[in-house]
């Protein structure tokens, strides 16, 4: 099918466009493009005709257009009007005739655009500032950039007119930045030169420094303040409400402990007009303190909080120590120093963590000690634990189960029997116990602190006859000379033993037979093919006793070294060769030869018609077993000779 | 002056055959298309058939396809339609006519004065 | 094939009047039509191609419109020598004409 395809699509004015024809039919008359979507011969462009390679210019002929031998079209210096369909018209040699309309789209080269904006000096949170990209340009698109990244997403920015205008509403002094505006078109994007927003704010709350407000005797006392400010605040010092000097740092050398007070920094916005100030009570001690701990959270809760613990007070100049049950601190990546060690943070506390901690100074004589601080780190519960374990009882007996499971502060706990609340204990007592005592018994362990909860369900079945035994194992496929497998006889009973049969005998005495939890779990180690047997368990009591189902043990073994048959080794020529390999193995192996090295095939049998001494050599055969990941394999030598040289040869399948 | 000329028509029995030759002059007959129109006796215009210029491209109208053949001869400036079984239905006015050289839709610029064909027993 | 329909067949007019012919196809024909006019024992005289370009030596009283199925002559001052049959004819392939429509004078 005839079709034109604009190259570009989207064009630049002055520039030039190519109409390019595909799928031109290759026996032409001639052809002819038009502008608008239709043949008309008032708005034709130009026309060629194949016979007398003419080219003939039509009423829409501008002297900007080239046509080519392949139909194609291309228009120079591109102007606006030249914007929309063109229709090529074809006449085949048979004067069919075929057109196809493509078209283009026109658009102008963009200027360099500018930000104008309506508030050069805005005051954070009072004022907006509307930044506007100039010039307003046709068909174009508008994108802003700050720090030339795109527009976050913010209720107090703004697009409006087009995207040409980007408000910021209530400016903070994190609108501080670099604006830039683009403009694009399908052909061009122009970028803005930056724009720098100069906010004015603050002054914040001025910040002290140093933090510590505990000095010695005899040392020099050098405080700073700051501020946050646009333009720089101006900074003024007050000590116990006296004004002191009007400069950012406060400097008294060899203080005493009349030099003890309030000291007040006032920081001022000439523009802005704001004051703000900051007190921070200085203490001269003549000695050094006793240190004492505080801690950030006096209840943290296991693997959700972490513990900030602060020896106080904060003194210049001084070395922080710590200690944990007695100990230096361990190595873990869950305590961390902070950089002057006066503050020791634990990260997802656990159980584990609750001390006892104790911090100290160091001064030039001696290390002062502080009290000791135990943390009480919130757990729990975890998992119940229902005691005892058994599950079977006869009618007549006590039940008494307790519940049990790790929490801080401790579980409070609840029984329920088949869904149904029965009460809020650690131990249920019930005696003298029927068959309709059987079922779900349920404790449930709650902290109230932490607000979780855990359950654990035991089925009881109280019966004068035991149940039917069965055996669970901890491995199904055990492998030969590699694996253990522990049977254990479920359920487990009150006051009832255990039996074990092998092949229908009881137990053979083997170091690698081991019996335990109370003769309920039998134990094999390094397991072996002959252990590939039927076990039964059986459990008795007072009253009754019964067997399990015999569970048979699938041992996986080989495999073996392989036998080639028959064992002969020479054969006459014009003979069958018909080899077979076996090897003891489970799973059954997979079998494959080798002649002379040579891969053959995967068959337990090789069968080669009529040999001849061609056939000499040697014969492997390889055997694996993919269950138990092993090999092995044989290796055969075959001699043909011819026939009648030598007797005695055999003579083949 | 552009001028065609055509000749070859007259009476005929019906499946006879005939050969109508048109003689051009004034333009470049070689690089032209070709045509040949019918008239009926007072009924409208039936084109018949085209001819590319170097004879390669022929086309003919449903009702003569297989009976009549257009040719032409560039070095004599003649075109030929040569009518075989000829039936009643083609006595007409036959007109011999020239597409013009130019890229447009095509249609016939110039026209002889035709010649009668009858077909009758 | 596509077939072509004019109306009227047949249509009386004074000099100076204005006659409009129209043309019908019976499938898309794009801008692919023509028109010629006829006068009794002469050869047909081509009057418009590609539906409306005018033929060079034909008066502009003559002009074309319409593309696709529907298209029109029209004679915007009707002179003497134009009561003649004019035929519209399909471009493309084959070469069909109109049954015709003649001019007579009223």
């Known amino acids: 099918k005839l079709t034109i395809e604009s190259t570009p699509f989207n064009v630049a004015e002055g520039k030039e466009v190519l109409l390019l024809v595909h799928n031109l039919p290759q026996h032409l008359f001639g052809y002819s493009w038009y502008k608008g979507e239709r043949v008309d011969g008032n708005r034709q462009i130009i026309g060629y005709v194949i016979g007398t390679q003419q080219a003939t210019p039509g009423p829409a002929y501008s002297g900007r257009e080239i046509i080519y031998p392949n139909a194609s079209l291309l228009i120079q210096n591109i102007i606006q009007n030249d914007t929309g369909f063109y229709t090529l018209h074809v006449i085949k040699s048979d004067l069919v005739n075929e057109e196809a309309t493509g078209q283009f789209r026109v658009y102008p080269e963009l200027p360099k655009p500018s930000i104008s904006s309506n508030n050069s000096k805005p005051v954070e949170d009072k004022d907006a500032v509307a930044f506007t990209c100039e010039p307003e340009t046709q068909d174009a698109t508008y994108l802003w950039w700050v720090n030339n990244q795109s527009l976050p997403v913010s209720p107090r920015l703004q697009l409006s007119n087009g995207n040409r205008t980007l408000t910021l509403f209530n400016v903070t002094r994190n609108d501080t930045a670099s604006y830039k505006c683009e403009t694009q078109n399908p052909v061009s994007a122009r970028r803005s030169d930056s724009v720098i927003l100069n906010v004015l704010y603050g002054p914040d709350a001025p910040t002290i420094s140093p933090l510590n407000t505990s000095y010695r005797s005899g040392e020099n006392l050098n405080l700073s303040c700051h501020a946050a400010s646009n333009p720089p605040a101006q900074y003024s010092w007050f000590v116990n409400g006296t004004f002191q000097q009007s400069t950012q740092e406060l400097f008294i050398p060899n203080i005493t402990v009349n030099n003890s007070g309030s000291y007040t920094c006032q920081a001022h916005n000439s523009d802005t007009g704001l004051n703000r100030t900051t007190v921070t009570t200085i203490t001269v001690y003549a000695e050094p303190p006793k240190p004492f701990i505080t801690s950030n959270n006096s209840n943290p809760v296991e693997d959700e909080d972490a513990v900030a613990l602060t020896c106080e007070p904060e003194i210049q100049n001084t070395t922080y120590l710590w200690w944990v049950n007695n100990q230096s601190l361990p190595v873990s990546p869950r305590l961390q120093l902070s950089n002057d060690n006066r503050t020791l943070t634990l990260l997802s506390v656990t159980r584990n963590d609750v001390g006892p901690y104790e911090c100290g100074i160091q001064n030039e004589l001696s290390v002062d000690h502080s009290d000791p601080v135990i943390l009480n780190v919130l757990y729990g519960p975890d998992d119940p634990t229902i005691s005892p374990s058994y599950t079977y009882y006869r009618p007549g007996v006590n039940l008494s189960l307790s519940c049990h499971a790790a929490s801080n502060p401790p579980a409070q706990y609840s029984w329920l029997i088949d869904g149904n609340i029965q009460q809020h204990t650690q131990e249920l007592f019930i005696s003298n116990i029927t068959e309709k005592n059987s079922g779900l018994y349920t404790c449930q362990a709650n902290n109230s602190a932490s607000g979780h909860s855990r359950t654990t369900v035991k089925t009881i079945t109280v019966s004068a006859e035991l149940p039917k035994p069965s055996i669970s194992s901890n491995n199904s496929k055990p492998v030969e000379d590699k694996d253990a497998v522990a049977f254990t006889c479920e359920p487990e009973a009150q006051n009832t033993t255990y039996l074990w049969w092998v092949n229908g005998q009881s137990l053979p005495v083997s170091p690698r037979l081991q019996l335990s939890n109370g003769n309920r779990t039998l134990t094999l180690f390094n397991v072996t093919r002959n252990d590939a047997r039927a076990y039964v368990c059986g459990i008795q009591n007072s009253v009754s006793a019964n067997r399990s189902d015999p569970v048979t043990l699938d041992v996986l073994y080989g495999p073996d070294t392989p036998i080639i048959s028959p064992p002969d080794s020479s054969y006459l020529s014009g003979a069958n060769l018909n080899l077979s390999c076996h090897s003891a193995s489970n799973p059954s192996p997979q079998y494959s030869w080798r002649i002379n090295g040579i891969p053959q095939q995967h068959t337990q049998v090789l069968f080669i018609a009529k040999i001849t001494p061609n056939n000499n050599g040697t014969y492997a055969c390889f055997v694996s077993n993919l269950a138990t990941g092993r090999n092995n394999s044989i290796v055969k030598s075959i001699t043909v000779s011819a026939s009648g040289t030598s007797p005695g040869l055999s003579a083949g399948a | 002056e552009v001028q065609l000329l055509e000749s070859g028509g007259g009476l005929v029995q019906p499946g006879g055959s005939l050969r109508l030759s048109c003689a051009a002059s004034?333009?470049?007959?070689?690089?032209?298309?070709m045509g040949w129109v019918r008239q009926a006796p007072g009924k409208g215009l039936e084109w018949v058939s085209s001819i590319g210029s170097g004879s390669y491209s022929t086309s003919y109208a449903d009702s003569v396809k297989g009976r009549f053949t257009i040719s032409r001869d560039n070095s004599k400036n003649t075109l030929y339609l040569q009518m075989n079984s000829l039936r009643a239905e083609d006595t007409a006015v036959y007109y011999c006519?020239?597409?013009?050289?130019?890229?447009?839709?095509?249609?016939?610029?110039?026209w002889g004065q035709g010649t009668l064909v009858t077909v009758s027993s | 094939d596509i077939q072509m329909t004019q109306s009227p067949s047949s249509l009386s007019a004074s000099v100076g009047d204005r006659v409009t012919i129209t043309c019908r196809a019976s499938?898309?024909?794009?801008?692919?039509l023509n028109w010629y006019q006829q006068k009794p024992g002469k050869a047909p005289k081509l009057l418009i191609y590609?539906?409306?370009s005018l033929q060079s030596g034909v008066p502009s009283r003559f002009s074309g419109s319409g593309s696709g199925t529907d298209f029109t002559l029209t004679i915007s001052s009707l002179q003497p020598e134009d009561f003649a049959t004019y035929y519209c004819q399909q471009a493309g392939n084959p070469h069909t004409f109109g049954q015709g429509t003649k001019l007579e004078i009223k």
């Open positions: 499938q898309s024909i794009s801008s692919y």
């Open positions: 004034g333009f470049t007959f070689s690089s032209s298309y």
């Open positions: 006519a020239r597409y013009p050289s130019v890229p447009f839709p095509p249609h016939f610029d110039y």
């Open positions: 590609a539906a409306s």
